[in-house]
């Protein structure tokens, strides 16, 4: 069983802050930035990120920060899923991933965090001011939902610190508690952004592990049939979505697409590129219990079909863990 | 507005069997999980089945083997086959809808079906 | 198998009094879910992950806690809110509900 951690990770780990302003200089503005936007630290970041050497290509990262085996991640773009948002990536952990133009490359980087590149041209090229989303669904207890976008001002090689999206609810409490700290952080680092405004940006590396804490308690699901419960959205750029997804590449994918519920991925139009791509085993995620692994920080191994946890495993979902955590 | 009514529960001597069925409405059935609980005269809740919607099934121990679960999501029903009943099966049956498709929990019951196992 | 036990069993409380009762899990759980059940009639949804209220349910109910030990409180007790409240969880299986704090007005 998990035991409880008593701090949760603010943020997803961050590429390397070594550049022009130097790693001293750097590393607690962008602590304090991260605070400044996570307080009330949801289940779920989003890292939207600007490549440096091609403006026109964007990277995604999103991780689940909540306990449970994840069931299914959706990426979209202009909005949460099934609300307004188009899908650009569905990744399945056993039956594969499926992209949609202008996605690149999307791909597991840990068991509970993916990456997408995105690039394109005209229509179907993203923009700065675009919003990114990721749901996370996870059997039986539910899906988290979060949003992120580039700042406006985001010069390129710089990272959009993890964002909460505004539907999920902060925990009022710890935010009031740290306030006084986050407002000074805050002056202090719009202190030090100015400085640097005209500054040469720094080179981020990525980096390619990701430990994380276990998270603290719930946070409610972003569900848009369940409006009612949650903040509604407040600005939503649709101005940079294309017109189209149909320049994907034409390969043939797996056959569980077909068995996917079509109102967990708003299939889009047009052919599907597709990699089945393992997740990679995880490094030190603590976070997930369930009734096979009793030791405290230990997580159920995706495991083939030789293991059969479900008494009636009667689709592919029954092969993901044991029944209290799918 | 989401309606769940139970029906087929009755008297039945030990060892057994019996259906009982749940009819939904004003949700796209085939969206979500639906579950069997049962209450025990003594009031205690005792989850029994669970449906997710790729009609995988999940059973406690104290059921496995003995009861089934299925759905028919053309005639937005839930059924739960249960056999070999002991007297400890005995309850109020009420039928679950999750709260979306990843999400298991009770958001919606019905108004229950009752079981009686008596010789 | 995760054992909820909740206590009090019975609470007598007079309206307009602060009300907390408690859920402790035999094994940490990520989240918790409670339930209202009013005589005759069947559980509703009340609260889920933990703390948050389901739709219909009044402000004045609250749900938090951690790891094996969670509880819902009622800021100001109201008739309307004499009933019997059951714990749940759905980390392990099998999903396992507690023995119910039964709320009685004084």
């Known amino acids: 069983m998990r035991t409880e951690a008593q701090v949760p990770a603010l943020q997803p780990p961050e590429p390397g802050l070594e550049g022009a302003m130097g790693h001293r200089t750097l590393v607690l503005p962008w602590v304090l930035l991260t605070l400044c936007v996570t307080a009330g630290t949801p289940e779920v970041w989003v890292q939207v990120r600007m490549e440096a050497t091609e403006l026109s290509s964007f990277t995604i990262r999103c991780g689940f920060l909540g306990s449970g085996s994840i069931s299914l991640v959706t990426v979209s773009w202009g909005g949460p899923n099934g609300a307004g948002g188009t899908t650009l990536a569905v990744l399945h952990p056993e039956r594969g991933i499926r992209q949609w133009a202008p996605a690149r490359q999307a791909r597991w980087e840990t068991q509970s965090s993916i990456s997408l590149i995105l690039e394109g041209s005209g229509a179907s090229s993203p923009c700065a001011n675009t919003t990114f989303c990721c749901k996370f669904a996870s059997f039986p207890e539910g899906s988290w939902e979060a949003c992120g976008s580039l700042p406006p001002s985001s010069d390129p090689g710089l990272s959009a610190p993890p964002t909460p999206a505004p539907i999920l609810r902060a925990d009022l409490a710890g935010i009031l508690g740290v306030s006084g700290v986050l407002l000074f952080g805050c002056v202090y680092l719009l202190h030090l952004l100015r400085r640097h405004k005209h500054r040469p940006a720094p080179r981020l590396q990525p980096s390619r592990t990701s430990p994380q804490a276990p998270r603290a308690r719930a946070w409610a699901p972003s569900q848009a049939s369940q409006a009612a419960l949650h903040v509604p959205y407040a600005t939503i750029n649709t101005s940079c979505r294309p017109a189209t997804l149909d320049t994907a590449h034409p390969h043939g994918g797996p056959s569980w697409w077909a068995s996917l519920p079509t109102h967990a991925a708003h299939r889009p139009q047009g052919p599907a590129a597709w990699a089945s791509t393992p997740i990679p085993a995880r490094g030190s995620f603590v976070s997930v219990e369930n009734g096979l692994y009793a030791q405290a920080g230990e997580r159920p191994p995706h495991t083939g079909p030789g293991l059969t946890l479900f008494p009636d495993p009667r689709g592919p979902r029954a092969m993901e863990g044991p029944l209290g955590v799918r | 507005e989401v309606k769940l009514v139970e029906s087929g529960g009755g008297l039945v001597k030990p060892g057994g069997s019996l259906k009982v069925s749940c009819a939904a409405s004003?949700?796209?059935?085939?969206?979500?999980?639906m579950s069997w609980v049962r209450q025990t005269p003594d009031k205690r809740l005792e989850w029994v089945a669970c449906?997710?919607?790729?009609?995988?099934?999940y059973y406690p121990d104290s059921v496995k083997g003995r009861f089934t679960i299925s759905r028919d999501n053309g005639r937005n029903i839930v059924n739960l086959q249960m056999s070999s009943l002991r007297s400890e099966d005995a309850a109020m049956y009420y039928c679950?809808?999750?709260?979306?498709?990843?999400?298991?929990?009770?958001?919606?019951w019905g108004q229950g079906t009752l079981v009686t196992v008596s010789a | 198998e995760n054992v909820l036990t909740q206590f009090p069993a019975i609470m007598s409380v007079f309206l307009g009094e602060r009300v907390t009762m408690s859920c402790r899990a035999s094994?940490?759980?990520?989240?918790m879910y409670w339930y209202q059940q009013k005589s005759d009639a069947s559980p509703k949804l009340w609260i889920y992950?933990?703390?948050n209220l389901a739709p219909g349910v009044p402000a004045r109910f609250s749900g938090s806690g951690s790891g094996n030990s969670y509880s819902l409180t009622i800021s100001s007790m109201e008739g309307e809110d004499a009933a019997t409240y059951y714990c749940?969880?759905?980390?392990?299986?099998?999903?396992?509900f507690g023995g119910g704090t039964k709320l009685e007005i004084k």
């Open positions: 679950a809808r999750g709260w979306d498709d990843y999400a298991a929990w009770f958001a919606y």
């Open positions: 094994s940490s759980v990520n989240y």
């Open positions: 749940q969880q759905f980390t392990s299986s099998p999903w396992t």
């Open positions: 004003g949700f796209t059935f085939s969206d979500y999980p």
């Open positions: 992950h933990t703390s």
């Open positions: 449906i997710d919607t790729d009609e995988n099934t």
